[in-house]
């Protein structure tokens, strides 16, 4: 059973390492894949002394942990590299960090990407 599934056909693309990887730095990435597989968008970033540095954004292969996520939100507490994935076109355009501890109340740190 799949409720309210949104198709992902394209994602915001960004690569901080674009020169070395020989890719574009930014743009829109069409998401390709097998017909029977779902596609997602993702974002990875770092927080260097309070400054947000985007590492990569783009398409992400079929991954059950991305199912039913309409927003790109990292919820892990204090990761080295922040990661989020989501379903829906360009859903990785905005991403945010809402750490959730097991017991304590979640706090929020919304992020506006500035590639």
């Amino acid at each position: 059973a799949i409720l309210g599934r949104s198709e992902t056909q394209e994602c915001l693309f960004f690569n901080a390492n674009w020169e070395k990887d020989r890719t574009n730095q930014t743009g829109v990435e069409p998401c390709y894949g097998d017909k029977d597989k779902r596609r997602h968008c993702f974002a990875t970033w770092k927080n260097i002394s309070g400054s947000i540095e985007i590492v990569k954004q783009g398409c992400w292969l079929d991954d059950i942990n991305c199912y039913d996520r309409t927003d790109c939100v990292e919820k892990k507490d204090s990761p080295e590299v922040y990661f989020c994935c989501c379903e829906g076109n360009m859903c990785n355009e905005k991403f945010s960090y809402f750490p959730e501890m097991e017991v304590t109340q979640p706090t929020s740190n919304p992020v506006t990407p500035k590639p």
Epitope: A1, I2, L3, G4, R5, G33, D34, D36, K37, R38, L61, D62, D63, I64, N65, C66, Y67, D68, R69, K75, K76, F83, C85, E100, M101, E102
Partner: antibody, heavy 118, light 111 residues
Framework: EVQLLESGGGLVQPGGSLRLSCAAS????????MAWVRQAPGKGLEWVSG????????FYTDSVKGRFTVSRDNSRNTLYLQMNSLRAEDTAVYYC???????????WGQGTLVTVSS | QTVVTQEPSFSVSPGGTVTLTCGFN?????????PSWYQQTPGQAPRTLIY???TRSSGVPDRFSGSILGNKAALTITGAQADDESDYYC??????????FGGGTKLTVLG
């Protein structure tokens, strides 16, 4: 420390029902997909069911479709497997597993034994 | 119906190297199937060894490595030890909510 503790197994007659539970601790349960995997006596591992973070998407192996229902209660950090119309071939140890990004099983419970016999 | 195939059994001498493989009937295994490998000793829950083709799980010794060999996923154990004697399972993520386990390989460490 991540812990997954299954319960609810036991002896049941063919055609009967059981509900398995998996109590999760040591991680933020609502952030991860979960799965059930079983192992019949002397046999290999078999994926049974999976469920997305919200519970909005559920998946089953063909042999249990229409008989088993997976669900989760994110407020109670608990995964469930409702098993109806049980058959002898459902006899197995049932493991719950946490699923990490790239869809692999990163932590496993110790399992609970379900025996279907008259 | 997807069937994932593994060698039913394999033997290795202590200190030797063994490569277990994982293929399927519908074509080639690629990294997009996120192959993962699990070790299980009798009466115990499985232990995660390798995920995403070649990433070792936390605490797994570097004697264990994963790769794609030709059209199959592979688990290589170098410098095999007595306590590597176990069952090894590969899993392929087929996407759209479906996983398929291989039948498992029973590894015997001789001697």
């Amino acid at each position: 420390e991540v812990q997954l503790l299954e319960s609810g197994g036991g002896l049941v007659q063919p055609g009967g029902s059981l509900r398995l539970s998996c109590a999760a601790s040591g991680f933020t349960f609502r952030n991860y997909a979960m799965a059930w995997v079983r192992q019949a006596p002397g046999k290999g591992l078999e994926w049974v069911s999976g469920i997305s973070v919200t519970g909005g998407s559920t998946f089953y192996t063909d042999s249990v479709k229409g008989r088993f229902t997976v669900s989760r209660d994110n407020s109670r950090n608990t995964l469930y497997l409702q098993m109806n119309s049980l058959r002898a071939e459902d006899t197995a140890v049932y493991y719950c597993a946490k699923v990490y990004y790239t869809s692999f099983f990163d932590y496993w419970g110790q399992g609970t034994l379900v025996t279907v016999s008259s | 119906q997807t069937v994932v195939t593994q060698e039913p059994s394999f033997s290795v001498s202590p200190g030797g190297t063994v490569t277990l493989t994982c293929g399927f009937n519908s074509g080639s295994v690629s990294t997009s199937y996120y192959p993962s490998w699990y070790q299980q000793t009798p009466g115990q829950a499985p232990r995660t060894l390798i995920y995403n083709t070649n990433t070792r799980s936390s605490g797994v010794p570097d004697r264990f490595s994963g790769s794609i060999l030709g059209n199959k996923a592979a688990l290589t154990i170098t410098g095999a030890q007595a306590d590597d004697e176990s069952d090894y399972y590969c899993v392929l993520w087929m996407g759209s909510g479906i996983w398929v386990f291989g039948g498992g390989t029973k590894l015997t460490v001789l001697g």
